[in-house]
């Protein structure tokens, strides 16, 4: 095997081309210099390299840049960022936007990866804070990117990021992170009439309290009661059955199928049974 | 949303020719590996060519090299398969597919027939 | 160029069985395997790819697992949906190549 550690005369690489895809993995190693490699990384994504002979381009990378990679490697990456560890990325300082979107494209179609969540992570604190085009880009490739910070990361999410969320985006939020986002998003969209600021606040109500919920039943808003049991259960007790009857308008009828569940089961029994029998639900406190 | 329509399949005697198309559609295939797989009737799966977005560099599997042509057209979105001097052997549903190393999207597939 | 066995060639289950299709590798191609499922008539699609990644939308009773030559999906409670033939590819190396499939029928 140690004849094979000198490169054979006439293959030393010149440039990254396409000639290299012949070239077997130690002849790879043996006659590709790494710092022709690092000068040419935009030419590696035009080159179908086997999965294999990645790992050679990273190796020889890895030996260049001990302390982790330039951004002027990072950005040509491609498919290389599949090789990477956590580990690897952590040595990593990612400034640019573009290069992130680079990198996320190679995972997309996928969960988020202990690669991707390290990237995106480096990333933020490089920034030092979630900016919106920050924010837009990670939630469009990953819709759940918002629920998987905690309220600690969330409460360095600037009020003009809320903009950017979709109600998708705050699916698999729970009440603590909602507690962080909703007065922010309700900072965000304060200057917005009635019915248009209840279409962007509806999916932020989750860390709504109760003086606040008592204002949205004098605006006819017709919460659906999806919505009405992602309500906070502390910020549900203390509203009156007629509250409860504004706020949900046509969808009040809605309670009686949800009786037994919280947050309805609670608030139906803080109630007067009088005042309940006014829905006309057959509910019993 | 993602979508690749392969056409131009057909009946063709031995020795004949055929082009097949792939129309994609959500995104586009100057950014992407381009696959034409194929399946012979009641068979597994054969990788048969590939075209590399960023060069248009192709490779071929050894049973079509020297036969078969992988291009595209990026103003079209489209990819091609030209296949010359058929045999009965190539007889099978074409598959074009999206990816670099695994393929994530396919298209419904268009069948090819040589036979005389 | 790299051989895909895949065993069995078909299995019969039952919904809500536990069933494990496997693949074996010609040689190592770490972690440079995905898999597909094909319904007759229709194009294969993607499940897992880099031996263990989910790909979107892939319901999470499949998984993959397996280690240089060796390679398993596994689906850990047969839904009506999953009869179908299953296929591994590697791409460690070009060509791809893929497993000759395992068809999953109902007992």
């Known amino acids: 095997e140690v004849e094979k550690t000198a490169c054979p005369s006439g293959k030393k690489a010149r440039e990254i081309d396409e000639s290299l895809i012949f070239y077997k993995k130690w002849e790879l190693e043996a006659c590709v210099d790494a710092a022709l490699l690092a000068t040419q990384m935009d030419r590696v994504n035009a080159i179908p390299f086997t999965y294999e002979q990645l790992d050679v381009l990273k190796h020889k990378l890895d030996e260049l840049y001990p302390q982790g990679y330039p951004e002027s490697v990072i950005q040509h990456l491609g498919y290389l960022f599949l090789k990477m560890s956590p580990e690897d990325i952590r040595k990593w300082n990612v400034t640019s936007l573009e290069t992130l979107k680079a990198l996320l494209e190679v995972n997309k179609g996928h969960e988020m990866s202990p690669q991707v969540a390290t990237l995106i992570d480096r990333f933020v604190k490089g920034r030092g804070q979630l900016d919106k085009d920050t924010l837009d880009t990670l939630t469009a490739f990953y819709p759940g990117y918002l629920c998987s910070l905690s309220p600690e990361e969330l409460s360095s999410v600037p009020p003009s990021s809320i903009w950017a969320v979709r109600p998708q985006d705050l699916d698999t939020c729970d009440p603590r992170q909602l507690d962080v986002l909703y007065p922010k998003a309700r900072l965000a969209f304060q200057n917005m009439n009635g019915s248009e600021y209840f279409v962007k606040i509806q999916s932020f109500l989750g860390g709504a309290p109760t003086e606040d919920l008592k204002a949205l039943s004098q605006q006819n808003v017709s919460m659906d009661l999806a919505t009405f049991m992602k309500l906070r259960t502390d910020a549900v007790l203390p509203l009156t059955v007629a509250e409860v009857q504004k706020l949900l308008g046509p969808h009040v009828e809605g309670l009686k199928a949800e009786e037994r569940h919280r947050p309805v089961r609670d608030w139906i029994l803080r109630q007067r049974q009088d005042d309940l029998d006014t829905l006309g639900l057959g509910l019993q406190g | 949303e993602v979508q690749l329509v392969e056409s131009g399949g057909g009946l063709v005697q031995p020795g004949g020719s055929l082009r097949l198309s792939c129309a994609a559609s959500?995104?586009?295939?100057g950014n992407w590996t381009i696959h034409w797989v194929r399946q012979a009737p009641g068979k597994g799966l054969e990788?048969?060519?590939?075209?590399?977005?960023?060069?248009?560099?192709?490779l071929y599997a050894d049973s079509v090299k020297g036969r078969f042509t992988i291009s595209a057209d990026t103003s079209k979105n489209t990819a091609y398969l030209q296949m010359n001097s058929l045999r009965a052997e190539d007889t099978a549903v074409y598959y074009c597919?999206?990816?670099?190393?695994?393929?994530?999207?396919w298209g419904q597939g268009t069948l090819v027939t040589v036979s005389s | 160029d790299i051989q895909m066995t895949q065993s069995p060639s078909s299995l019969s289950a039952s919904v809500g069985d536990r069933v494990t299709i496997t693949c074996r590798a010609s040689?190592?191609?770490?972690?440079?395997v995905a898999w597909y499922q094909q319904k007759p008539g229709k194009a294969p699609k993607l499940l897992i790819d880099?031996?263990?990644r989910l790909y979107s939308g892939v319901p999470s009773r499949f998984s993959g697992s397996g280690s240089g030559t060796d390679f398993t999906l596994t689906i850990s409670s047969l839904q009506p949906e999953d009869f179908a033939t299953y296929y591994c590819?590697?791409?460690?190396?070009?060509?791809?190549?893929f497993g000759q499939g395992t068809k999953v029928e109902i007992k």
């Open positions: 597919a999206r990816g670099r190393y695994w393929m994530d999207y």
């Open positions: 959500g995104f586009t295939i």
């Open positions: 990788w048969v060519a590939l075209i590399w977005p960023e060069s248009g560099a192709t």
């Open positions: 040689q190592d191609v770490r972690d440079g």
């Open positions: 880099q031996m263990v």
């Open positions: 590819q590697q791409y460690f190396n070009w060509p791809v190549t």
